[in-house]
């Protein structure tokens, strides 16, 4: 139930953390599974445990197997497992899967590789960075803390990353490296409901007559490119162009916006001249596409 | 405001099963460890089963293999299924919190405390 | 298991008056992280337990001053400055090192 698997190569270090919940004052125990014997905490030793961590400087082949560790907490102590295995190193470029993190997913607007398990280390900018075993080099590629960012993702871009980095312990160095495969996706849109932003439902609006006045009715469809989206006005539940007053016309063409990524319509209702009679018809803000059409209702008074 | 609500009890036939419920509000429910503890009338108070935030359950010898212990983050709720009840399980049940896996600072014991459930097993 | 015993078991105490509770463990509540795992509650007629004292010597939020715990190890003390009618109910002493056991209870009652 709390076991973690971890892993690494041979030489390299390898820091695992005690999959069970700790708080500084509480001491964690280590143990080798198998022979139930005690990990050392001196750090003269090249296995140690150090809280809830437990440190490989460097790791070997024959350090593979079940550790436990145990949080000395009031009331309960806490059990968990760390199965670590160590590899030999690949003489070839090829990763085994067996060596991969997790996958993590890219796109044009957001394309950061986290450096798998670097919080655990005791590590100093730069990291390297390889794709594919060769050295990323180039302006779209920037090391930024524990990540990395591509500039432009392209679908050439997925593949292997790894990143390199030096652990320091006591005026000790030893290199780390983690891989993991990164893939790019095609922003994905979709279309909802629309949602009317203004005006609100049953608003009241105040003009003053003989001026101008505009009403904006706006509206939101959904993620990228909508096939069927629209937004108008009608006056009294007829379109305006049918209404047959000159004053009172919507503004041609139709403003496209990109609200929180979400693509948006607004249309204005331009009133000149602002007459006694205006105040008694019903604006209605109309938003529709494939999903239906939604309505909002607006009304004019004079404003004091 | 911090507050447990207990629900559930109730009078139930010896061998029989009782499930109680606890509601919580007012606090981050998913980082803290939860207990029942019952108190048999007229007497002391005595602990019978415990989760802790990651999940792991802990139980006294006298309800172990009877009674378990449960919860739902989401739901906010701890739930404890008593099976095999027997006339030594006449109690209140109280549900109570527990320590605070977000604070490294102090633990407080058992520092909120439901109404309690009064459960009574009798044929 | 730690068991915990308390003396005496039941008090009667005039208004304005001392009282002291005494509640000792069958083992060390020291824990590893140098804490000291002892609480104190008091449960009122028809009430849940409320928490008074934890760690041994520090008052809960909102309990008034006249309430204090001392002690170490495995010999620990309630004690109440001057007791009020307020203050009548059953005061436990309980320990969480090792799972949770409490005490029999001291019965407290105004003369």
């Known amino acids: 139930k709390f076991s973690k698997q971890s892993w690494g190569l041979e030489n390299e270090a390898l820091i695992v953390r005690c999959p069970r919940q700790g708080k500084p004052s509480y001491t964690v125990d280590w143990y080798y599974s198998q022979t139930n014997k005690s990990i050392p905490t001196q750090e003269r030793n090249r296995v140690f445990a150090s809280g809830q961590l437990l440190k490989f400087l460097p790791a070997e082949v024959a350090d593979s197997g079940i550790y436990t560790c145990i949080v000395r907490s009031p009331t309960f102590n806490r059990t968990g497992y760390a199965n670590v295995t160590i590899y030999k190193k690949q003489s070839d470029c090829n990763v085994p899967d067996y060596l991969m993190y997790s996958t993590v997913s890219g796109s044009e607007k957001n394309s950061k590789i986290y450096c798998p398990t670097i919080d655990l280390y005791n590590w100093t900018a730069p990291l390297e960075w390889f794709k594919n075993c060769q050295a990323l080099q180039g302006s779209r590629y920037r090391a930024h803390k524990s990540f990395l960012v591509i500039d432009n993702v392209m679908t050439e871009d997925a593949g292997d990353y790894t990143c390199k980095f030096i652990h320091n312990e006591n005026g000790a160095n030893y290199s780390v490296t983690a891989t993991r495969s990164f893939t790019v996706k095609d922003e994905q849109g979709f279309s909802l409901f629309p949602v009317i932003g203004a005006p609100a439902q049953n608003e009241i609006k105040e003009v003053e007559i003989g001026k101008n006045a505009n009403l904006t009715c706006s509206a939101c469809f959904g993620k990228g490119t909508q096939f069927l989206a629209a937004v108008l006005w009608q006056l009294n539940g007829t379109k305006i162009t049918d209404f047959g007053e000159p004053r009172i016309q919507q503004e041609e063409g139709q403003n496209q916006s990109f609200s929180n990524g979400l693509a948006c319509l607004d249309m204005v209702l331009r009133i000149a001249d602002v007459k006694e009679e205006d105040l008694l018809l019903q604006y209605d803000c109309l938003a529709l596409n494939l999903h239906g059409l939604r309505r909002h209702t607006v009304r004019l008074s004079r404003k004091n | 405001e911090v507050q447990l609500v207990e629900s559930g009890g109730g009078l139930v036939q010896p061998g029989g099963s009782l499930r109680l419920s606890c509601a919580a509000s007012g606090f981050t429910f998913s980082t803290f460890d939860m207990h029942w503890v019952r108190q048999v009338p007229g007497k002391g108070l005595e602990w019978i089963s415990s989760?802790?935030?990651?999940?792991?359950?802990y139980y006294p010898g006298s309800v172990k293999g009877r009674f378990t212990i449960s919860r739902e983050n989401a739901r906010n709720s701890l739930y404890l299924q008593m099976n095999s009840l027997r006339a030594g399980d006449t109690a209140v049940y109280y549900c109570t919190r527990g320590e605070d896996w977000s604070d490294d600072d102090y633990y407080y014991g058992l520092d909120v405390w439901g109404q309690g459930t009064t459960v009574t097993v009798s044929s | 298991n730690i068991v915990m015993t308390q003396t005496p078991l039941s008090l009667s105490v005039t208004p304005g008056q001392p009282a002291s509770i005494s509640c000792k463990s069958s083992?060390?509540?020291?824990?590893?992280?140098?804490?000291?795992?002892l609480f104190w509650y008091l449960q009122k007629p028809g009430q849940p337990p409320q928490l008074l004292i934890y760690g041994v010597s520090n008052r809960f939020s909102g309990v008034p001053d006249r309430f204090s715990g001392s002690g170490s190890g495995t010999d620990f003390t309630l004690k109440i400055s001057r007791v009020e009618a307020e203050d009548v109910g059953v005061y436990s002493c309980m320990q969480s090192l090792q799972l949770f056991t409490f005490g029999p209870g001291t019965k407290v009652d105004i003369k």
């Open positions: 989760i802790d935030t990651e999940g792991d359950t």
């Open positions: 083992q060390s509540l020291l824990h590893s992280d140098g804490k000291t795992y």
